[in-house]
Each structure stands twice: as structure tokens, then as C-alpha cells.
């Protein structure tokens, strides 16, 4: 399987909510002993490999934000810890995997990485990540709502989390 980032850049005004999304596509094994571990973290654009550095998102680690479920299941982080920080990660039946960040501040700007791991019984088999940039802006130059720029071209799309 592969991970695609639908948008490579999100530009949002302060105070807005945003949902960053990765999509898992390609053959996904749905055997009874196959599960998926999915998570989010902040990183920086390394010279060697993007997403190799792990930093927390609003003080929550990749383990705090992780989901673990069967290949055919939807899941979301319902625990209080994430919600208290204005965060929720979710995964649906169609391979979309997202993190919603509420009430954005300038400190949320940076590189965000999603990680998807296929686990066969007790063994970590495949590890794939995707990366996207979030820019939170303030002042007269800030957009009125979040604008997302697709990974393939620079046509923008207005997106705002509910």
C-alpha cells in the first residue's frame, strides 16, 4: 500500500479549525491477523529524509494520538487527552486518515507527518508516511478560511473543519 497526501500545504487564519488528511491506497490486506497502526506527529524537513524527526503536536506524542484497528474498520481517538488539546485523529472505511486541530494559533505552523504501519500478527511489516505543511497566518494578509493546495498542482481549495 501507499500513503498519499491530498494537500501539501494548508494556509489557515488564526482561530480556525483544520483537518489534515492522508489517504491509504493500493492493496490493503484485510486478513484477520492484519491490523494498522496510524498516527500523526510534527517534524522538520530533514536534508536526508522528511518525517524522520518526531516532535509532539500540542504536547501530545505520536503514541498519544495513535489509532490501531483492523484493515476494514473505522476508528477515532475519543480519549479526553487529545480532545483537551483540541485534537482528534480519525480513520474511515475509505482509507482516509486525518487529524483535526481546533482553534489554530501561530505556534501550530510547521510540518506534519502521518505514519501508517501494517502489522501482520505481531510483526511490523510496512511503514509508510506522508508529509504536509501547515501555515497559520494572522493580520490582514491571512485568508478568511483555510485554503488547501493540492499536492500535484497549485490550484487551491477552501477547506474548513466543522
Amino acid at each position: 500500500f501507499k500513503v498519499a497526501t491530498l494537500y501539501s500545504l494548508y494556509v489557515c487564519p488564526e482561530g480556525q479549525n483544520v483537518t489534515l488528511t492522508c489517504r491509504v491506497f493500493g492493496p490493503v490486506d484485510k486478513g484477520h491477523d492484519v491490523t494498522f497502526y496510524k498516527t500523526w506527529y510534527r517534524s522538520s524537513r530533514g536534508e536526508v529524509q522528511t518525517c524522520s524527526e518526531r516532535r509532539p503536536i500540542r504536547n501530545l506524542t505520536f503514541q498519544d494520538l495513535h489509532l490501531h484497528h483492523g484493515g476494514h474498520q473505522a476508528a477515532n481517538t475519543s480519549h479526553d487527552l487529545a480532545q483537551r488539546h483540541g485534537l482528534e485523529s480519525a480513520s474511515d472505511h475509505h482509507g482516509n486518515f486525518s487529524i483535526t486541530m481546533r482553534n489554530l494559533t501561530l505556534l501550530d505552523s510547521g510540518l506534519y507527518c502521518c505514519l501508517v504501519v501494517e502489522i501482520r500478527h505481531h510483526h511490523s511489516e510496512h511503514r509508510v508516511h506522508g508529509a504536509m505543511e501547515l501555515q497559520v497566518q494572522t493580520g490582514k494578509d491571512a485568508p478568511s478560511s483555510c485554503v488547501a493546495y493540492p499536492s500535484s498542482s497549485q490550484e487551491s481549495e477552501n477547506i474548513t473543519a466543522a
Epitope: 504501519v117 502489522i119 505481531h122 510483526h123 511490523s124
Partner: antibody, heavy 121, light 106 residues
Framework: QVQLQQSGAELMKPGASVKISCKAT????????IEWVKQRPGHGLEWIGE????????NYNEKFKGKATFTADTSSNTAYMQLSSLTSEDSAVYYC??????????????WGQGTLVTVSA | QIVLSQSPAILSASPGEKVTMTCRAS?????MHWYQQKPGSSPKPWIY???NLASGVPARFSGSGSGTSYSLTISRVEAEDAATYYC?????????FGGGTKLEIK
């Protein structure tokens, strides 16, 4: 906070059976494997087998087939291991361990405090 | 069955020394886990996937290796590191542990 609480020490007669319990709190018990591990003095750690509480699926180390039997009760979040036809070779500390998937890597992330089983005539 | 052989069985070191213990597998593995056990206590998860430290493990610990050879290194041993360290594979049934390396502090 994840915790695995095991039942207390047992002194058993040869030929008898014993049932050890492992009560889990702090996580979704049904979705993660419970592992059972044997430790005899000077023998290190030995994997006996595992059970997935939600489905009842089990996997055994061939060496312990017929010796150990695993069950789980999801209503009480408790896993059990029964050891039968006890001999002095079964005298050991038995641990239950909960599978944790950390950074996408499953491992023995949570351990009970151990149950000492002594077999003596 | 994949056999994990740890060496040395007993390792004696003075505080501040660098120590390395090894774990050799009878078949090639993708990665190795390590656990620490102190007398009278349950094992603790210590290093996962060859080189990643579990939460709370001091940075003086490190792990490395690939294929059939793996190692755990402590850059500067401290008294609290006295324990037995076990390697473990979760690649094939039966899942096995090494025999352990007991670290003694002089």
C-alpha cells in the same frame, strides 16, 4: 494507566491442576493479545502462548500444548491460564503480559506482577 | 524455532564504564526487542525495534544491529542499571527470548 493484576501464589500437589488469572484495566482488553510467559530460576523467560480475548483465538508454543489452556472473560476483563498434570518442572513464576503496539511495533508492553506456582508433594 | 543466544551470560562493570551485550539469532530477523528485569520484579520493556528507547529509558542506553546480530550498549554504566537484559523476537512462533545477560556493578 494500564495494569495487569495476577492472582496470588499457589502451592500444588503433583498431578493437580491450577488456574491463574490476569485482570486487565486501563485499555481495550478485547483488542489486544494477552501473552503468558514462564520463568524458572536460571532458565530465563519462556513464551507459553497467547489469547486474543475478543475472539478467543489462541496460539500455543508446541512445547506447552496439552499443558496450558487459555481462556478469557471479556465481561470482567480477565484472562486465565490453566496448567494441568503438574510436575516439579512446572514450578515457576508465570507472567501475563499485554501486547502494546508502540510506534507501530507490537511488543510485550505491559506485565503482570507474576504468579509463583510451587509443585511439591 | 528461532534461537536467541545472548553473550556474555554475566557482565561485570564499574560505574562510568561502557558496556555492550549481544544477541545472536539462529535466523535473520527484521528487528529485535529488549527487556530489563531486576530481581523480584517483572520484566520492563526497554528497547523496541532494535534501536528505539521505551519511554523513560535513559539516553545512555542504545541498541543496534540487523539480520542475525543485535546489541545493547550502555555508554556510562550506573548502579541502577544492574539487572538482567533479555532480547526477544516476535517474528515467528514460538516467540522466543534470549537466555539473558546479567549486568553486575562492581
Amino acid at each position: 494507566q494500564v495494569q495487569l493484576q495476577q492472582s496470588g501464589a499457589e502451592l500444588m500437589k503433583p498431578g493437580a491442576s491450577v488456574k491463574i488469572s490476569c485482570k486487565a484495566t486501563g485499555y481495550t482488553f478485547s483488542r489486544y493479545w494477552i501473552e503468558w510467559v514462564k520463568q524458572r530460576p536460571g532458565h530465563g523467560l519462556e513464551w507459553i502462548g497467547e489469547i486474543l480475548p475478543g475472539s478467543g483465538s489462541t496460539n500455543y508454543n508446541e512445547k506447552f500444548k496439552g499443558k496450558a489452556t487459555f481462556t478469557a472473560d471479556t465481561s470482567s476483563n480477565t484472562a486465565y491460564m490453566q496448567l494441568s498434570s503438574l510436575t516439579s518442572e512446572d514450578s515457576a513464576v508465570y507472567y501475563c503480559a499485554g501486547e502494546e503496539v508502540y510506534d507501530g511495533y507490537p511488543w510485550f508492553g505491559y506485565w503482570g506482577q507474576g504468579t509463583l506456582v510451587t509443585v511439591s508433594a | 524455532q528461532i534461537v536467541l543466544s545472548q553473550s556474555p551470560a554475566i557482565l561485570s562493570a564499574s560505574p562510568g564504564e561502557k558496556v555492550t551485550m549481544t544477541c545472536r539469532a539462529s535466523s535473520s530477523l527484521s528487528y529485535m526487542h529488549w527487556y530489563q528485569q531486576k530481581p523480584g520484579s517483572s520484566p520492563k520493556p526497554w528497547i523496541y525495534a532494535t534501536s528505539n528507547l521505551a519511554s523513560g529509558v535513559p539516553a545512555r542506553f542504545s541498541g543496534s544491529g540487523s539480520g542475525t546480530s543485535y546489541s545493547l550498549t550502555i555508554s556510562r554504566v550506573e548502579a541502577e542499571d544492574a539487572a538482567t537484559y533479555y532480547c526477544q523476537q516476535w517474528s515467528s512462533n514460538p516467540y522466543t527470548f534470549g537466555g539473558g545477560t546479567k549486568l553486575e556493578i562492581k
